[in-house]
């Protein structure tokens, strides 16, 4: 099935600290879709301090699951997270609001973290940033 | 406790190359980018690129393309930087950091004297 | 490229005085600015990141400030330990850069 196209898809999930914080992402698509990351509306640059990471891929999945890594953010990083996916058969997106401390370890997990998702094709969803 | 100790620095001809060493201990070696700075009396810091130990990623500021290549040996948890076509204004202190939080870590620094 | 720049140059002060260092970006750098400490002979180490969160171990008369483009250092007392250069960098785009420095002197 891996030569037929299939429109791109992605996922956002909440926000987790590891040695670092991760918005965990998942995206599909045949072709692999292009990934740009917007925060608070505008492109975001990535740095060696705010990355995409893609986790192994599977054998015989199109699906890859990844992060954007956030090396221990701030205040500064507090908004609105917003991931597009784009290939030839279609577009996604989904956004997720992050609200960090200045440091982490005071993160609350019982304080909810708004989410919100504004689907621009189907199959896109969105939960919240986690720590792990 | 995180510790990135550097090595390789020296008196070089005009012209030659170098490899610096920046051996990392006390974190994940692999989970965080090292960065590499240039330092030289009255002109501050300069930053001269980034590296990725997990992937081999690499950013580099243009000013140093050409002059500088970053690698690491993973097995070995210590990063490189060759520098070539060596001239007098590549004499400098040349330092490793962490990229954590800021820089949050530093190598001592490695002395780079270029004379013939 | 983003250009960062420190004032005073220099900076000489008596223990127990409060002191500012100020820093300036020639564009928008999103608060993704940090302070260095370099004392003679050693390397920079982190104070600051982010703007205004302290780096772990850091005494708290270390204080930073600012957004966008203006941010400061403040130190609350001068100790004889803080003589220094103390450096800001940015790291929200590339290439990195740092100011020129300033020096700070005890008298």
């Known amino acids: 099935h891996h030569h037929h196209h299939h429109p791109a898809s992605v996922q956002l999930h909440e926000a987790v600290e590891l040695h670092h914080w991760c918005i965990p992402f998942s995206v599909d698509g045949q072709p692999a879709p292009s990934l740009r990351w917007l925060f608070n509306g505008s492109v975001l640059n990535e740095t060696s301090f705010i990355f995409t990471e893609f986790l192994e891929p599977v054998a015989n999945e199109t699906v890859r699951h990844g992060c954007l890594r956030l090396n221990q953010p701030t205040h500064v990083n507090n908004g609105n997270y917003t991931l597009l996916a784009a290939n030839p058969s279609g577009r996604a997106a989904a956004f997720v609001m992050a609200a960090f401390m200045d440091n982490p370890f005071e993160f609350n997990p019982e304080d909810p973290i708004p989410v919100s998702f504004s689907p621009v094709d189907t199959n896109s969803t969105s939960g919240d940033p986690v720590e792990k | 406790e995180v510790q990135l100790l550097e090595s390789g620095g020296g008196l070089v001809q005009p012209g030659g190359s170098l490899k610096l060493s920046c051996k990392a201990s006390g974190y994940a070696f692999t989970n965080y980018w090292l960065g590499w700075m240039k330092q030289r009396p009255g002109h501050g810091l300069e930053w001269i690129g980034d590296f990725y130990p997990r992937t081999g990623n690499t950013f580099y500021n243009e000013n140093f393309k050409g002059k500088v290549t970053l690698t690491a040996d993973k097995s070995s948890n210590t990063a490189y930087m060759q520098l070539s076509s060596l001239t007098s204004e590549d004499s400098a202190v040349y330092l490793c950091a962490r990229a954590g939080t800021g820089f949050d870590y530093w190598g001592q620094g490695t002395t780079l004297t270029v004379s013939s | 490229e983003i250009v960062m720049t420190q004032s005073p140059a220099t900076l000489s002060l008596s223990v127990g005085e409060r002191v500012t260092l100020s820093c300036k970006a020639s564009?928008?750098?999103?608060?993704?600015v940090s302070w260095y400490q370099q004392k003679p002979d050693q390397s920079p180490k982190l104070l600051i990141y982010?703007?205004?969160s302290r780096h772990t171990g850091v005494p708290d008369r270390f204080t930073g400030s600012g957004s966008e483009t203006d941010f400061t250092l403040t130190i609350s007392s001068v100790q004889a330990e803080d003589l220094a250069a103390y450096h800001c960098?940015?790291?929200?785009?590339?290439?990195?850069?740092f100011g020129g420095g300033t020096k700070l002197e005890i008298k």
């Open positions: 564009e928008n750098v999103g608060g993704y």
């Open positions: 960098g940015q790291n929200y785009i590339y290439p990195f850069t």
């Open positions: 982010g703007a205004s």
